[in-house]
């Protein structure tokens, strides 16, 4: 999906007001400094294409987040405010249902949230481009 | 400390597909980082080609994009290229490289294709 | 597409004299900017990010400066390992990440 034509601050204001509390809740107990972030975003549509992927795409050791209030959210803001989004999402939608049965919190997990969290924010930073 | 090592042939036929792989040591690709490649024609500047990250997003180069892929072994803990259709304007040294999704951390020593017949 | 053009194309300096590169770059790219080492049969080395932070175990000796379309690496005082060519590169327009044509550093 091309999130080029995304209402940006719209989704910003989904960000500050619920998924990054909700991304604070999930890493409740972390310290801030416990994991690196290796991995970062250039403009608008880069920084959603990688939180997309990173939010929704099981990874090694972590293949429990779609489920996450987090995760939700984001999926409802990329719907709502991406043109298109929704009719791109219905096959790993049904993919997801399958694949993921219950949420379980692992350390690789928390550090998945953690590049999250630095994806988020490199979003929202005032200077960065729209695309 | 990691380390990245290009290898594949050196000699690719016009209208050819050029395969590379890239072995990494001391670090696991789907732990961390994207996974880039990048090349430099003998004699001229650097040019990227694309990345996928840790967790298997991938992005290329418009100007390369309909050639491209860039896949991952990660039993290996290696990466590959592969660009078709290659013409004499795709010899180049290919290095592979560690990034941030930005700017390239780490880089393999380079490996050199040259496309002829 | 961001065009990346630097200069001087060649800089000959001695060991010990300071060196000024400058990278300019088509459009404002703020502060999303690389610079690189590549010294003759090797890859490049990552010297600076986000325009003006060293990367690990750069010497001090190096540092960056500018943003939006301006940009300058320097070299405050050239050691013999430091003749070199050096890229820019912007990694503000993604995908469309570009680099520098580079500027080589020779001994005069």
């Known amino acids: 999906y091309d999130f080029t034509n995304c209402d940006f601050e719209k989704i910003k204001a989904a960000y500050l007001s619920t998924i990054s509390k909700d991304l604070i809740t999930y890493m409740s107990g972390t310290k801030s400094t416990e994991f690196n972030n290796t991995v970062s975003c250039s403009n608008r549509p880069h920084c959603l294409t990688e939180i997309q992927s990173l939010t929704f795409n099981p990874t090694a050791g972590c293949a429990s987040l779609a489920k996450e209030m987090f995760a939700m959210k984001t999926k409802a803001a990329l719907a709502i405010w991406c043109p298109g989004y929704s009719e791109t999402q219905i096959n790993a939608t049904q993919a997801m249902k399958k694949a993921r049965k219950s949420k379980v919190t692992t350390n690789k997990c928390l550090e998945q949230v953690s590049q999250l969290q630095g994806l988020w924010r490199r979003f929202n930073r005032p200077l960065l481009k729209q695309q | 400390q990691v380390q990245l090592q290009e290898s594949g042939p050196g000699l690719v036929k016009p209208s050819e597909t050029l395969s590379l792989t890239c072995a990494v040591s001391?670090?696991?690709?789907?732990?961390?980082?994207?996974w880039s490649w990048i090349r430099q024609p003998p004699g001229k500047g650097l040019e990227w080609i694309g990345y996928?990250?840790?967790?298997?997003?991938?992005s290329y180069n418009p100007s390369l994009k309909s050639r491209v892929t860039i896949s991952r072994d990660t039993s290996k803990n290696q990466f590959s290229l592969k660009l078709s259709s290659v013409t004499a304007a795709d010899t180049a040294v290919y290095y592979c490289?560690?990034?941030?999704?930005?700017?390239?951390?780490?880089w393999g020593q380079g490996t050199l294709v040259t496309v002829s017949s | 597409e961001i065009v990346m053009t630097q200069s001087p194309a060649t800089l000959s300096l001695s060991p010990g004299e300071r060196a000024t590169l400058s990278c300019r770059a088509s459009?404002?790219?703020?502060?999303?900017l690389a610079w690189y080492q590549q010294k003759p049969g090797q890859a490049p080395r990552l010297l600076i990010y986000?325009?003006?932070s060293r990367a690990t175990g750069i010497p001090a000796r190096f540092s960056g400066s500018g943003s939006g379309t301006d940009f300058t690496l320097t070299i405050s005082s050239l050691e013999p390992e430091d003749f070199a060519v050096y890229y820019c590169?912007?990694?503000?327009?993604?995908?469309?990440?570009?680099f520098g044509q580079g500027t080589k550093v020779e001994i005069k």
């Open positions: 490289a560690r990034t941030n999704l930005l700017y390239f951390d780490s």
């Open positions: 001391g670090y696991s690709i789907s732990s961390g980082y994207g």
């Open positions: 996928f990250s840790y967790y298997g997003s991938t």
């Open positions: 459009q404002s790219v703020s502060s999303n």
């Open positions: 986000d325009a003006s």
């Open positions: 590169q912007q990694y503000s327009n993604w995908p469309q990440y570009s």
